[in-house]
Interface confidence: low
Amino acid sequence: QSPIFGPQDVSSIEGNSVSITCYYPDTSVNRHTRKYWCRQGANGYCATLISSNGYLSKEYSGRASLINFPENSTFVINIAHLTQEDTGSYKCGLGTTNRGLFFDVSLEVSQVPEFPNDTHVYTKDIGRTVTIECRFKEGNAHSKKSLCKKRGEACEVVIDSTEYVDPSYKDRAILFMKGTSRDIFYVNISHLIPSDAGLYVCQAGEGPSADKNNADLQVLEPEPELLYKDLRSSVTFECDLGREVANDAKYLCRKNKETCDVIINTLGKRDPAFEGRILLTPRDDNGRFSVLITGLRKEDAGHYQCGAHSSGLPQEGWPVQAWQLFVNEESTIPNSRSVVKGVTGGSVAIVCPYNPKESSSLKYWCHWEADENGRCPVLVGTQALVQEGYEGRLALFDQPGSGAYTVILNQLTTQDSGFYWCLTDGDSRWRTTIELQVAEATKKPDLEVTPQNATAVIGETFTISCHYPCKFYSQEKYWCKWSNDGCHILPSHDEGARQSSVSCDQSSQIVSMTLNPVKKEDEGWYWCGVKEGQVYGETTAIYVAVEERTRGSPHINPTDANARAKDAPEEEAMESSVREDENKANLDPRLFADEREIQNAGDQAQENRASGNAGSAGGQSGSSK
């Protein structure tokens, strides 16, 4: 499929002008390459009529232009003074030859329609109301007034002043006079439908003294607005149907041959194919609304229509707005996972791409909710506090310049399953949808923190350890202190942790964090995690409570109390400068010794201990200032 897109059918009348917009993928080459408009001949050859290189054919001289708009990735062909000879098949395209990338356009130029003399032409859109004005002389002021529609030679009465109304115009047509006017009557026809189009005659009086006026009514199908969007990007349908339908239910539907299938409406209907990736938002109190669809797929391409009716369904004779959506498969938006799986108690790291040209834009993450028209409350953002219920377990890590940010959610529960959106307040195309599926855990988490009930005592030293499996051996381990504006990584001091290792002792990989001395403001959530460069992996969280030392209680070194028989000597030292003062997270060398003794005591049966382990006594040291 060609990535060039434009209007398939263009129609106009002799003497008028047309403006044809063609869309191309947003690439540097495309912006600068030759654009052309050519006419398709019977022999298959497409003869250039105008191009961006400055070529202009004889038959277009003085009446056509081709303008490139690289900032919009479009070019526009304007053709004036149309004649019926301009009817035919054309191509708009890109490339040095007319065989490159193109889109087929059919142009039809009709004759100017002929009407009886003094015919007033009314042009209205489907669903709207027309007011036909009928003038008469004073002699017919008290005579019967009527409006009829010409069908061949006959003229069938639509409405008259005796209160007759043709059944097909019932509840749609009214005849009235305004104020004290004695020489004009009006006929309103509302909820216009295509079959209402035609020639009407209004009449006051009978016989030769009757006053007659001709009115030609043209009822227009909505001209679809063309929307050119990249695969995986998002599209917004901005619908403005007017105040007269402000209080009616609104809908967006997708045309399917003769019908239009509702995708979403304000009465709660939603097509399952759009679950998790659609929002309907009222824009103001005048009936304006928008429908946003993210994560565009190939199959989303097609004709869409928005409308209003109390049923929330398409109805003939009600106003509509139309679009044709083209989904360009040559997308600039990277392919990211649309489904992320996690387990209860575990964590997920979701990478959200954004337009790299907009690194300063606000990034945010919201949870799509199905109620009513769909909504997406922000859970976390670069300038937004983490929402209630997510404290200590949700953080956004921006990676300026990388074109992506990462959202980490841990302490997962099955209630976290659902759809989430990655957004920025900049380029609205870069909105991605992720479905999070959380299953019940069947095994222990990969990262485990000890002690699990972490209470630190002010003024003392406190250490917590994070156990990780061998599969994370080569990855960077970190501790961070969670706060409402992110999880700030504590500076690490790791020596010997990346030495080559012949084998890995599954039970002996630890990264520890020490607070020394503990202060009141150390209380809060801490995360232990793994990452490789800018790619974040598994995390686990622990809440560290801080309390005053109770008088008279024996002084127990928390580092001894926290030691576990299963804890191991494979340590990476972390130095935490949580504050600017001397509260560095110094590693207590005694801790390693204690842990080693306990570990070895319970480990006699283990043969084949790796002699070259990264954390062996000789290769490990505490942090030093």
């Epitope: 929002l279 938002t281 909504r375 997406c376 922000v378 953002g381 959106w421 909105r431």
Partner: nanobody, 121 residues
């Protein structure tokens, strides 16, 4: 949800000056454009000036060179400095903002209640 509160209107003589301000509050996540519109009795509401998020400004021809729009993003506030006021500037001035809230990521139009500016000798 989102409130826009205008202030600074009043009665002023031709040639005088006024400074209007409009503060947005509520569960705001981001504001795209902020601007001023006005409506004189019996007339349509018309654009006066807009300050876009990117920093660009746009003025109605009738106020160019006399009115200056400015914006304080940190305070979610937009100002309109009106100099060399003329009787034709008499109208109700309305603040408008395109806001994405903490509940809905799409931008939506919000309007203030309006502040009256009367230029008369």
């Amino acid at each position: 949800e989102v409130q826009l509160v205008e202030s600074g209107g009043g009665l002023v003589q031709p040639g005088g000056r006024l400074r209007l301000s409009c503060a947005a509050s509520g569960s705001i996540f981001s504001i795209r454009d902020m601007g001023w519109y006005r409506q004189a009795p019996g007339k349509q509401r018309e654009l006066v000036a807009i300050f876009a998020r990117g920093g660009s400004t746009h003025y109605a021809d009738s106020v160019k060179g006399r009115f200056t729009i400015s914006r304080d993003n940190a305070k979610n506030t937009v100002y309109l400095q009106m100099n060399s006021l003329e009787p034709e500037d008499t109208a109700a001035y309305y603040c408008n903002a395109e806001v994405a809230t903490m509940i809905q990521p799409g931008f939506r139009d919000y309007w203030g209640q309006g502040t009256q500016v009367t230029v008369s000798s």
